[in-house]
Interface confidence: medium
């Protein structure tokens, strides 16, 4: 399908002008290629009428032009002094007329209505309000005032000053007679319907002395605003319906093939399941305006959207509406990224978030979509490192891999973490994307002890076990903080051939803190990655305590919680049986070692891979 998009139907009146805007993907080639407006003939050929290269056909000379806006990916065709002969089928396009990079536009030019002299013309959108002004002479001031609608040769009474109201206008019309001295009465019609369209007659008094004034009321369906967005991107519909409906329920609906309108979302809590997790109805302002954001755009989201107000939260005739025609461009600049990421309870996920690569300095955010209250998205983390309290130690936003993608890591997963999350920046809002996290059955691949208590001044060693499938990955330990996860210095991870063969003695990466200081308290992550692409992580909290007074019964210098069976050894080293480990098949025994002896040289914090003293067993 062609990525060029424009208005399907354009209608106007003889003598008037039209402005036709066509959209195209703003690639470098497209921005500079020829743009054209041509008319389709009976033969199927399309004859150029105006182009961006300066050509204007004789028929269009002096009344048409084409302007390209390459920075927006749009071009505009203006045609003036329209005649009925301009009605027909046209194409706006790029390149060569026959190439197919075009959009079909139907132009209909109708004859203007023949109106009686002195007729006042009122042009109002459907659902809005019109005030018809009716002047009269002093002698008719005390006499009956009325408004009639002309239907063919007859006049039908709509409203008069004797309290008559035509049933078709019930509860939406009023006649106002001013105080003395003002020789004008007004008729106000609210919530205009298409059927209200037509010629009206104001009358004051009767007989030959009566005052009359003609009014032509043109009720228009709102011209849909064309919206051109990229596949996988985001769209915002800003809906401003006016103060008169500020306190009425609002909705966004999509027109279906039967020309009815299916509610997408409304302020009464209704939401189309097709938009679950990727829509927000932003709370309305006091002037009644609101906006709807849809992310993760799909081709099937294309179509005509209406926003409106009605107490039922759905489209009703005679209530104000706004319209959009959404086109989803499949030649998207937004890269594909997983829309569903799966993790296991206790495990982790690494989510890749795209952003506009031209905006590398923009702030990045991640928020959790909430379905309540028309959809809300509280921010959980942002690129300056700030993390919401309840996510401390288990959530980090990393600028890597960069160049249009950032990474969000969430670990210590629980079933509560399942849901939809949005990737955001404070830059180009069209790059908002949605990812769903699903929690599935299984065990985490990385195994670390539970929370660990370390003793000031001593050595702490924390093991992290990984399965064979991660043997080719880079392993790391990092210390989590609000500003990210600072990688700790890494030591040689053992002979490379051991990793290649997945030697069972090489499936452990250990963190050593020597000596332990107060500043070491906090969250540590063990993780795997390939280049700048992050894989699984596991988190452990290290608490730091003072050394106990000599002679007292021993308290482990490096104590891991949730170890049901432990032997207290005279050497001051506590052994944790495999019951503390989530997958006993992965390794038989784990030691959290507090080494009271001095270590010669070496870094204070180090990561090292060594034997896990496995008794066999295989990883999943």
């Amino acid at each position: 399908k062609s990525p060029v998009f424009g208005p399907q139907e354009v209608s106007s009146v003889e003598g008037n002008s039209v402005s036709i805007k066509c959209y195209y993907p703003p690639t470098s080639v497209n921005r500079h290629t020829r743009k054209y407006w041509c008319r389709k003939g009976a033969s199927g050929r399309c004859i150029t009428l105006v182009s961006s290269e300066g050509y204007v056909s004789s028929n269009y000379a002096g009344r048409a032009n084409l302007t390209n806006f390459p920075e927006n990916g749009t071009f505009v065709v203006n045609i003036a002094q329209l005649s009925r002969d301009d009605s027909g089928h046209y194409k706006c396009g790029l390149g060569i007329n026959s190439r197919g990079l075009s959009f079909d536009v139907s132009l209909e030019v109708s004859q203007g209505p023949e109106l009686p002299n002195g007729t006042e013309v009122y042009t109002v959108d459907v659902g809005r309000t019109v005030t018809i002004k009716c002047p009269f002479k002093t002698e008719n001031a005390p006499k009956t005032k009325a408004l009639y609608k002309k239907i063919g040769q007859t006049s039908v009474l709509v409203i008069d000053s004797r309290n008559y109201v035509n049933p078709n206008y019930k509860d939406r019309i009023r006649l106002r007679i001013p105080g003395t001295g003002q020789l004008i009465f007004t008729v106000v019609i609210d919530r205009l319907r298409l059927s209200d369209h037509g010629l009206y007659l104001c009358q004051a008094g009767d007989g030959s002395n009566r005052d009359e004034k003609n009014a032509d009321l043109q009720v228009l369906e709102p011209e849909p605003e064309l919206v051109y967005e990229d596949l996988r991107g985001s769209v915002t519909f800003h809906c401003a319906l006016g103060l008169e409906v500020a306190n009425v329920a609002k909705f966004l609906c999509r027109v279906n093939s039967r020309e009815t309108c299916d509610v997408v979302i409304n302020t009464l809590g209704k939401r189309d399941s097709a938009f679950e997790g990727r829509i927000l109805l932003n709370p309305q302002d006091k002037d009644g305006s609101f906006s709807v954001v849809i992310t993760g755009l799909r081709k099937e989201d294309e179509g005509r959207y209406l926003c409106g107000a009605h107490s039922d939260g759905q489209l009703q005739e005679g209530w104000p509406i706004q319209a959009w025609q959404l086109f989803v461009n499949e030649e998207s600049t937004i890269p594909r990224s997983p829309t569903v990421v799966k993790g296991v309870a206790g495990g982790s996920v690494a989510v890749l978030c795209p952003y506009n690569p031209k905006e590398s300095q923009s702030l990045k955010y991640w928020c959790l979509w909430e379905g309540a209250q028309n959809g809300r998205c509280p921010l959980l983390v942002e690129s300056q490192g700030l993390v919401q309290e309840q996510y401390e130690g288990r959530l980090s936003l990393l600028q890597e891999p960069g160049n249009g993608t950032f990474t969000v890591i969430l670990n210590q997963l629980t079933t509560q973490d399942a849901g939809f999350y949005w990737c955001l920046t404070n830059g180009d809002t069209r790059w908002r994307t949605t990812v769903e996290i699903k929690i599935i059955e299984g065990e985490p691949n990385l195994k670390v002890p539970g929370n660990v208590t370390a003793v000031l001044g001593e050595t702490l060693n924390i093991p992290c076990h990984f399965p064979c499938k991660f043997s080719s990955y880079e392993k790391y330990w990092c210390k989590w903080s609000n500003t990210g996860c600072q990688t700790l210095p890494s030591q040689d991870e053992g002979p490379s051939e051991a990793f290649v063969n997945c030697d069972e003695n090489s499936r452990l990466v250990s963190l050593t803190l020597n000596p332990v200081t107060r500043a070491d308290e906090g969250w540590y992550w063990c993780g795997v990655k390939q280049g700048h692409f992050y894989g699984e992580t596991a988190a452990v909290y290290v608490a730091v305590e003072e050394k106990k007074v000599a002679g007292s019964r021993y308290v482990s210098p490096a104590k891991a919680d949730a170890a049901p069976d432990e032997k207290v050894l005279d050497s001051g080293v506590r052994e944790i049986e495999n019951k503390a480990i989530q997958d006993p098949r992965l390794f038989a025994e784990e030691k959290v070692v507090a080494d009271t002896g001095d270590q010669a040289g070496g870094s204070r914090a180090s990561v090292d891979s060594s034997s896990s003293e496995e008794q066999g067993g295989s990883s999943k």
Epitope: H238, N282, S291, V381, E382, L386, Q388, E389, L424
Partner: nanobody
Framework: EVQLVESGGGLVQAGGSLRLSCAAS????????TGWFRQAPGKEREFVAR????????DYADSVKGRFTISRDNAKNTVYLQMNSLKPEDTAVYYC?????????????????WGQGTQVTVSS
């Protein structure tokens, strides 16, 4: 949590100007959107202005449009409200509030963090 401290209030004559400041400390992610609200004696607290983190999206109450300007300095974690052409009806306690909700329009209910307020009195 985030702490918000307002300053800059005071007594000013009608037609005069004041600049209010709101300094945030702590978990400033909760000031992704920062707003100013005001409460006059015996009246409900009402929205005055709001600004998002980037400063690119601002919104004002009709009663202050063209007179008040909201801005922010992220390096200082501070949001400002410049109030010009002050009127007696602007007299109120002005509160700064923060929200972590990503939203095009943020209403009163979306603000979870509030300051203690600063008194602004405009005499005629």
């Amino acid at each position: 949590e985030v702490q918000l401290v307002e300053s800059g209030g005071g007594l000013v004559q009608a037609g005069g100007s004041l600049r209010l400041s709101c300094a945030a400390s702590g978990r400033t992610i909760n000031t992704y959107v920062t707003g100013w609200f005001r409460q006059a004696p015996g009246k409900e607290r009402e929205f005055v202005a709001r600004i998002d983190w980037s400063g690119s999206s601002t919104d004002y109450a009709d009663s202050v449009k063209g007179r008040f300007t909201i801005s922010r300095d992220n390096a200082k974690n501070t949001v400002y409200l410049q109030m010009n052409s002050l009127k007696p009806e602007d007299t109120a306690v002005y509160y700064c509030a923060g929200s972590a909700y990503y939203s095009g329009y943020v209403t009163h209910r979306d603000f979870g963090s509030w300051g203690q307020g600063t008194q602004v009195t405009v005499s005629s």
